[in-house]
């Protein structure tokens, strides 16, 4: 389970994203971002410093629209 406001790295980060985002899937950098994919992403925000559940959820993919 997710413990708020702590650093999440490596496998823990991936596992937590899978738990939080579920079937939606997730990104390591927000798709809307125009900056380099490595410049600022979830690794920097959650592993290099601590992050919370709200921030984690911003990296979840948008669910596909059903026809």
């Amino acid at each position: 389970a997710y413990r708020p406001s702590e650093t999440l790295c490596g496998g823990e980060l991936v596992d937590t994203l899978q738990f939080v985002c579920g079937d939606r899937g997730f990104y390591f950098s927000r798709p809307a971002s125009r900056v380099s994919r490595r410049s600022r992403g979830i690794v920097e925000e959650c592993c290099f410093r601590s992050c919370d559940l709200a921030l984690l959820e911003t990296y979840c993919a948008t669910p596909a629209k059903s026809e």
Epitope: C9, G10, S36
Partner: antibody, heavy 121, light 107 residues
């Protein structure tokens, strides 16, 4: 092909600092995280920290916090690791290692040749 | 920090043998385990990541398995170039930590 070339061996006195460089080639420097790992003579491997060559942000192992500084120069595709307040226990081979994963998983697919740092009075 | 314990610390084997190396984590790490091979005076080489995924270019005689706290590296049909030291490493959380190594020696 991917190559990580480190600077040469160093001999330092206790209390001094050392700065080791690692020049990358054969790939897009800013697209892969870089780690530093050390190995004392005849001993195992010890992770020191990670740097994002794109933004320059870093994360260090608690053990080295306050003594280690990792930086990068994108113009020369080089990362640096500086260790201060050296003691005899810091005698080791220092490796830079590239992370193969976008999630900074610590999967080191390419390594530098290693830099031997000897700390002796 | 997660402690990684390898066994045995050394093993003597002959060319053609099957060698099994075990790695235990002090807490569950799912499948976030890596195996490296290191020869004297050289940098380590990535063999297996995510417990069982073979790194590109690594011979198929190497295989990894396990999850949770217990992991295994198997070398089938041991070749002369396989005599080396093998390290496991957890990639579940920082600090990343390594096992103490297993030296595979010629019998």
């Amino acid at each position: 092909q991917v190559q990580l070339v480190e600077s040469g061996a160093e001999v330092k006195k206790p209390g001094a600092s050392v700065k080791v460089s690692c020049k990358a080639s054969g790939y897009t420097f800013t697209s892969y995280y870089m780690h530093w790992v050390r190995q004392a003579p005849g001993q195992g491997l010890e992770w020191m920290g990670i740097i994002n060559p794109s933004g320059g942000s870093t994360s260090y192992a608690q053990k080295f916090q306050g003594r280690v500084t990792m930086t990068r120069d994108t113009s020369t595709s080089t990362v640096y690791m500086e260790l201060s307040s050296l003691r005899s226990e810091d005698t080791a081979v220092y490796y830079c290692a590239r992370d193969r994963s976008i999630a900074a998983m610590g999967w080191f697919d390419h390594w530098g040749q290693g830099t031997l740092v000897t700390v002796s009075s | 920090d997660i402690q990684m314990t390898q066994s045995p610390s050394s093993v003597s084997a002959s060319v053609g043998d099957r060698v099994t190396i075990t790695c235990r984590a002090s807490q569950g790490i799912s499948s976030w385990l890596v195996w490296y091979q290191q020869k004297p005076g050289k940098a380590p080489k990535l063999l297996i990541y995510a417990a069982s995924r073979l790194q590109s270019g690594v011979p198929s005689r190497f295989s990894g398995s396990g999850s949770g706290t217990l992991f295994t590296l198997i070398i089938n049909n041991l070749q002369p170039e396989d005599f080396a030291t093998y390290y496991c490493q957890q990639s579940n959380s920082v600090p990343l930590t390594f096992g103490g190594g297993t030296k595979v020696e010629i019998k």
